[in-house]
């Protein structure tokens, strides 16, 4: 058993049929010695008396808010949550496996630049009695500070018969050094509590590996005289790190016909313009990627050829 | 050329070669064998490699003030990785795949280090750790890790040379 926060405790249980469970001793936070009784949740049934209460925790019915009283007055509370371990593996019932970039990916994180600011998100089908708490650091043995905000519900989607909820959190490294080569990864830890179930999820990454620039901005076409060719131009996204002579992007320009089956013409360039042939009913799209490190491409910015 | 006394490197040549190194480091990565790295502990095998750190003067301001500190750091790293690529880790069994561009990567590391430090000038170089894995699977894992950290290292070096070529070239 360990303390998650003041008066909230997590009991770690091996979860299998007829498991013996864990013996837990609760102590009433009071100077009083006599006349103390214990109850669980809203029930008035007295579970025991005395300053300490010993219970055998085996299932969710044994978890909940234990309260010690004296003469009708509440002295203190202890909330017990369960953390299940099945076949040596901690349960992951609360969050949905996003399966990207690989199986057992519950947390996904992205950064728009090298400033040390990043966003993580996760999915669940649970709508009520759900709380999250997020902590982060750079490195684990001698951790350096990363400050995370509160997790918020950022999107709701209907997936088949059930709803899916997306939560996200923003974090900022306290003393970020955008130009340095990271040697210690960022660690993100999410505590999830659903009713009386506790789970924790972690992710470890370098900012450089989660970079995804915003799409190029101000995408424009300029027809070239007496030609089917057009000059496409664009600019770096506002959110990208500066100076651009240091934090450079590379771009992929694509000409795509209306039908997905039509041949795509693609050009790679480090410049912020390119000359392409504009076909009727086609569209021109541009996306960006860090020039020197193959992290994610941005989403496409597009304009119609006409 | 960046000589210990402090004249300027051939920024544009260094920029081109360092950008080439970035492509080679990425293209070599899947071709040194096959395994999922994520499951393996990262720090203990590659924490000996030189990193370009915050105080090394490789940020835009540091380069403007005095690029020599940064260039020396980059040179140390290039020599370090060049030695690793020539070591038993990459030459031993299991053999690199035939398609692997590790030979190009090796030559380019040496080429860039020579651009930074012509014959006859000597910056201190870092000791190469004795990473001599006994098992072929350990060697495979080390190759992956070395290439992953090389990708990060050359990305920073390429930014330095791109910025230098754009702002510090005479």
């Amino acid at each position: 058993i360990w303390e998650l926060k003041k008066d909230v405790y997590v009991v770690e249980l091996d979860w299998y049929p007829d498991a013996p469970g864990e013996m837990v001793v609760l102590t009433c936070d009071t100077p009083e010695e006599d006349g103390i009784t214990w109850t669980l949740d809203q029930s008035s049934e007295v579970l025991g008396s005395g300053k300490t209460l010993t219970i055998q925790v085996k299932e969710f019915g044994d978890a909940g808010q234990y309260t010690c009283h004296k003469g009708g007055e509440v002295l203190s509370h202890s909330l017990l949550l369960l953390h299940k371990k099945e076949d040596g593996i901690w349960s992951t019932d609360i969050l949905k496996d996003q399966k990207e970039p690989k199986n057992k990916t519950f947390l996904r994180c992205e950064a728009k630049n090298y400033s040390g600011r990043f966003t993580c998100w996760w999915l669940t089908t649970i709508s009520t009695d759900l709380t999250f708490s997020v902590k982060s650091s750079r490195g684990s043995s001698d951790p350096q500070g990363v400050t995370c905000g509160a997790a918020t519900l950022s999107a709701e989607r209907v997936r088949g018969d059930n709803k899916e909820y997306e939560y996200s959190v923003e974090c900022q490294e306290d003393s970020a050094c955008p130009a340095a080569e990271e040697s210690l990864p960022i660690e993100v830890m999410v505590d999830a509590v659903h009713k009386l179930k506790y789970e924790n999820y972690t992710s470890s990454f370098f900012i450089r590996d989660i970079i995804k620039p915003d799409p190029p901005k101000n995408l424009q076409l300029k027809p070239l005289k007496n030609s089917r060719q057009v000059e496409v131009s664009w600019e770096y996204p506002d959110t990208w790190s500066t100076p651009h002579s240091y934090f450079s992007l590379t771009f992929c320009v694509q000409v795509q016909g209306k039908s997905k089956r039509e041949k795509k013409d693609r050009v790679f360039t480090d410049k912020t313009s390119a000359t392409v042939i504009c076909r009727k009913n086609a569209s021109i799209s541009v996306r960006a990627q860090d020039r020197y490190y193959s992290s994610s491409w941005s989403e496409w910015a597009s304009v119609p050829c006409s | 050329r960046a000589v210990p006394g402090g004249s300027s490197p051939a920024w544009t040549q260094c920029q081109q070669l360092s950008q080439k190194l970035c492509t080679l480091a990425w293209s070599a990565h899947p071709l040194v064998g096959h395994m999922d790295l994520r499951e393996e502990g990262d720090e203990e095998t590659t924490n000996d490699v030189p990193h370009i750190q915050c105080g090394d003067g490789c940020d835009p301001q540091g380069l403007r003030d005095n690029s020599q500190f940064c260039l020396q750091r980059i040179h140390q790293g290039l020599i370090f990785y060049e030695k690793l690529l020539g070591s038993d880790i990459f030459t031993g069994e299991p053999s690199l795949l035939p398609d692997s561009p590790v030979g190009q990567l090796h030559a380019s590391l040496l080429g860039l280090s020579q651009l930074l430090q012509p014959e006859g000038h000597h910056w201190e170089t870092q000791q190469i750790p004795s990473l001599s894995p006994s098992q072929p699977w350990q060697r495979l894992l080390l190759r992956f890790k070395i290439l992953r950290s090389l990708q990060a290292f050359v990305a920073v070096a390429a930014r330095v040379f791109a910025h230098g070529a754009a702002t510090l070239s005479p």
Epitope: - | T23, L24, S27, P30, L31, S95, G103
Partner: antibody, heavy 116, light 107 residues
Framework: QVQLVQSGAEVKKPGASVKVSCKAS????????MTWVRQAPGQGLEWMGQ????????DYAQKLQGRVTMTTDTSTSTAYMELRSLRSDDTAVYYC?????????WGQGTLVTVSS | DIQMTQSPSSLSASVGDRVTITCRTS??????LAWYQQKPGKAPKLLIY???TLAEGVPSRFSGSGSGTDFTLTISSLQPEDFATYYC?????????FGQGTKVEIK
Amino acid sequence: QVQLVQSGAEVKKPGASVKVSCKASGYIFITYWMTWVRQAPGQGLEWMGQIFPASGSADYAQKLQGRVTMTTDTSTSTAYMELRSLRSDDTAVYYCARGGGGFAYWGQGTLVTVSS
Amino acid sequence: DIQMTQSPSSLSASVGDRVTITCRTSENIYSYLAWYQQKPGKAPKLLIYNAKTLAEGVPSRFSGSGSGTDFTLTISSLQPEDFATYYCQHHYGIPFTFGQGTKVEIK
């Protein structure tokens, strides 16, 4: 299994251009360099250049610089080699080969004849 | 550019003979060397890469050795199907260059 299938033979006049294609299958196209090698009749092998499909980054033999362009179409896993301002000494069999080191997989070759 | 000097340029041998072809480079190329076999009208076939590693499907009578600047391809017991032209190629930095070839003919 890995296969590289090249376009058919071409006959060109001096000064013209030729574009040879090489369609790859059986592997992840963007992960491997594609190299072009040519062989003049009765002669040895000559490295022309290479391209990395994931980024479009290409390198060319110095003697061909300015006349050769290598491109890829990642949507169809096809590599192209275009040679411009053809001369009679460009008459050769042109091969594509997978990789940026030793070449374990080769196309069947495309004979380009330059003749007036 | 790295120069490749292959020798001999041709040789005559009989079935069962041990044949050795050498390749010398103008500078150190570590072990980044490949050997190919080519028959008339066909694409080259990779035999050896990284100086000594046998490519997939290549008979064990072929072997490669050497590092630095001096390399050798050995055919321990020449078979009828081995009469062909052999090329060495370095893959240490671009441009890659090939040796001028060694034609192995029937005595």
